[in-house]
Amino acid sequence: CDLPQTHSLGNRRALILLGQMGRISPFSCLKDRHDFRIPQEEFDGNQFQKAQAISVLHEMIQQTFNLFSTEDSSAAWEQSLLEKFSTELYQQLNDLEACVIQEVGVEETPLMNEDSILAVRKYFQRITLYLIERKYSPCAWEVVRAEIMRSLSFSTNLQKRLRRKD
């Protein structure tokens, strides 16, 4: 299971698609900017065994997939780009699930670092709450799109650290 290689490629494709999804100029939404307090420490590969890194990455992508699979999201984005982006996320989820089965050493270690998983979930709860408070406005979605690009970049960095561990 060459997780770091396949996942980084998938992540890059997802980032490109998410970049293409932008509909309005970020400069017109400067007043809507918000600090979602991304849990950066959860993307520090040094503190994780590979199994736990896999589950944190999966959590990140699953929560992103959940966010972009809502009816409100469907109304906000161009459908074919949204579908391609979602398909890319789904493929990454499948790859990560398969890695748990294939990766030597994952079996012996716990998959869960509960604090890390909860930190990622709370981060996405803050994003969802922001969208609700801003009534899913175009600028709110633009701010969220930029934030998810940032979080996907962090997850790519975690991948690179994992590759160095290999």
């Epitope: 896999i54 999966h58 929560q63 997939f65 699979s69 089965i101 079996e107 998959l111 869960m112 998983i117």
Partner: antibody
Amino acid sequence: EVQLLESGAEVKRPGSSVRVSCRASGDTFSSYPISWVRQAPGQGLEWMGRILPALGVTNYAQNFRGRITITADKSPLTAYLELSSLRFEDTAVYYCASPSADIIPSILGTTLFAFWGQGSLVTVSS
Amino acid sequence: EIVLTQSPGTLSLSPGEGATLSCRASQNVSRHYLTWYQQKPGQSPRLLIYGGSSRATGVPDRFSGGGSGTDFTLTISRLEPEDFAVFYCQSYHSPPPVYTFGQGTKVEIK
């Protein structure tokens, strides 16, 4: 909490088709798969296939390929099972089942069935 | 394709006794992807244990799961009257996604 409500019992002739529906309510996500699992009278559980409603992606068990079709609507979140060329041995209770978004970590969520419908009895009889 | 074989087929025990149910896989299964369910007559299955050993919400601590590789166990430390049912193990494999059930073990009152 997710509630899954299936359509009522059906009696079908051999060779015909049946369509069973499963409506999800509560804390539902179209980004988690909905599966169909059947149980013949006095027998064990058998996974038939699943659908990811967000994308319409399906996966079918080898045993059913060629005569099973699973579809879904996203709003209201509903999954459908269609089984064709029915045989007497298809007489069973058909359950829809889904994972839980609350399972920690989420990587385990799609590997299990946390929520089950009440079951829909399909009887194949001449 | 993975085959899960549960044993024994039937277990006759009295309330208060302990029970150990076995689930053997035809090839290695990730313990993270091994799940146990309980099913009572006329009811839908209920999630008991996931990830090999994590109890689902509301499941009493008398239920525990263990094992790895090809051999897994569900242990009930002290049987309560409401525990008598059929128990199924289930594995997940990907890609493509495949869910496999064991044939079940019936725990009945002696």
